[in-house]
């Protein structure tokens, strides 16, 4: 069975998100994103910043979905 390893808040998620960032990340700082594994206890969108940080976000936040759409289009 898959083990969810711990992460420091919403940053540096190993595989799953346990908490979400409470801040809206400026769009220009984001380079890429990925969706966490569906086996995780809660869903998450991980944004990767230009500085290489991985930030867990809540997929239900409008700004998160807006960023995903923007990145898909571009």
């Amino acid at each position: 069975t898959k083990t969810e390893s711990s992460s420091r808040g919403p940053y540096h998620p190993s595989e799953c998100c346990f908490t979400y960032t409470t801040y809206k990340i400026p769009r220009q700082r984001i380079m890429d994103y990925y969706e966490t594994n569906s086996q995780c206890s809660k869903p998450g969108i991980v944004f990767i910043t230009k500085r290489g940080h991985s930030v867990c976000t809540n997929p239900s936040d409008k700004w998160v979905q807006d960023y995903i759409k923007d990145m898909k289009e571009n």
């Epitope: 979400y20 997929p59 239900s60 936040d61």
Partner: antibody
């Protein structure tokens, strides 16, 4: 006028599979998310899952293993499928829509009247 | 997971009176809280979002307040039409609803 309406529920047996359809009118699924929420008799509201305006489905942890939410943008419908029903799934099932106006797609201002699903042998 | 505890479960108020409903979260939810009104046999109706912002068309006698883990819905000048069950919803973490508070208007 924007509205959503759930298909008829009814009586199901334990281990049955539930399929409910939410039909939306007055807005497009390409700009709205649809949530499924249920309410057992005399109990509070319980989130099941949602499908985003780009068609990605997400689920509550308890529902993930036996729920599937899909949509048909041509027919303006969203479908909830829930397998392995038990008596604990007896509830009124609501679909609810939101366009993110309230900063989050879980916050819904368009609700259907709900449909009663009873699971009993 | 966040647990939302609503108190009281039942409250009675005279017409024109004031009703206060509390919602406590087991962890901070950063004002990501909504309030819904639900009348018997009807779906929920959104009243308040982001803890204190009134949804479209909601009368100003409804007021939301709070931050961190403690949130309050206040109804001033209660009317007969306000008889309903009121539920809080956190949308910071897992989309959890409170157990509901039934408001009876005398």
């Amino acid at each position: 006028c924007q509205s959503v309406k759930e298909s008829e529920g009814g009586l199901f047996k334990p281990a049955d599979t539930l399929t409910l359809t939410c039909t939306v009118s007055g807005f497009s699924l390409s700009s709205y998310a649809i949530n499924w929420v249920r309410q057992a008799p005399g109990e509070g509201l319980e989130y099941i899952g949602w499908i985003s305006d780009v068609g990605t489905a997400y689920y509550a942890s308890w529902a993930k293993s036996r729920s599937t939410i899909t949509r048909n943008t041509d027919e303006n419908t969203v479908t909830l499928k829930m397998t392995s029903l038990t008596a604990a799934d007896t509830a009124t099932y609501f679909c609810a829509g939101g366009d993110g106006s309230y900063s989050n797609y879980w916050v819904s201002d368009i609700w259907g009247q709900g449909t009663l699903v009873t699971v009993s042998s | 997971a966040v647990v939302l505890t609503q108190t009281p479960s039942l409250v009675s108020a005279p017409v024109g009176g004031t009703v206060t409903v509390k919602c406590r979260a087991s962890q901070t939810i950063n004002s990501r809280l909504a309030w819904y009104q639900q009348k018997q046999g009807q779906p929920p109706k959104l009243l308040i979002y982001e803890a204190s912002k009134l949804a479209s068309g909601v009368p100003s006698r409804f007021k939301g307040s709070g931050s961190g883990t403690e949130y309050t819905l206040t109804i001033r000048g209660v009317e007969c039409a306000d008889a309903a069950t009121y539920s809080c919803q956190e949308y910071a973490d897992e989309n959890i609803f409170g157990g509901g508070t039934e408001v009876v208007v005398k």
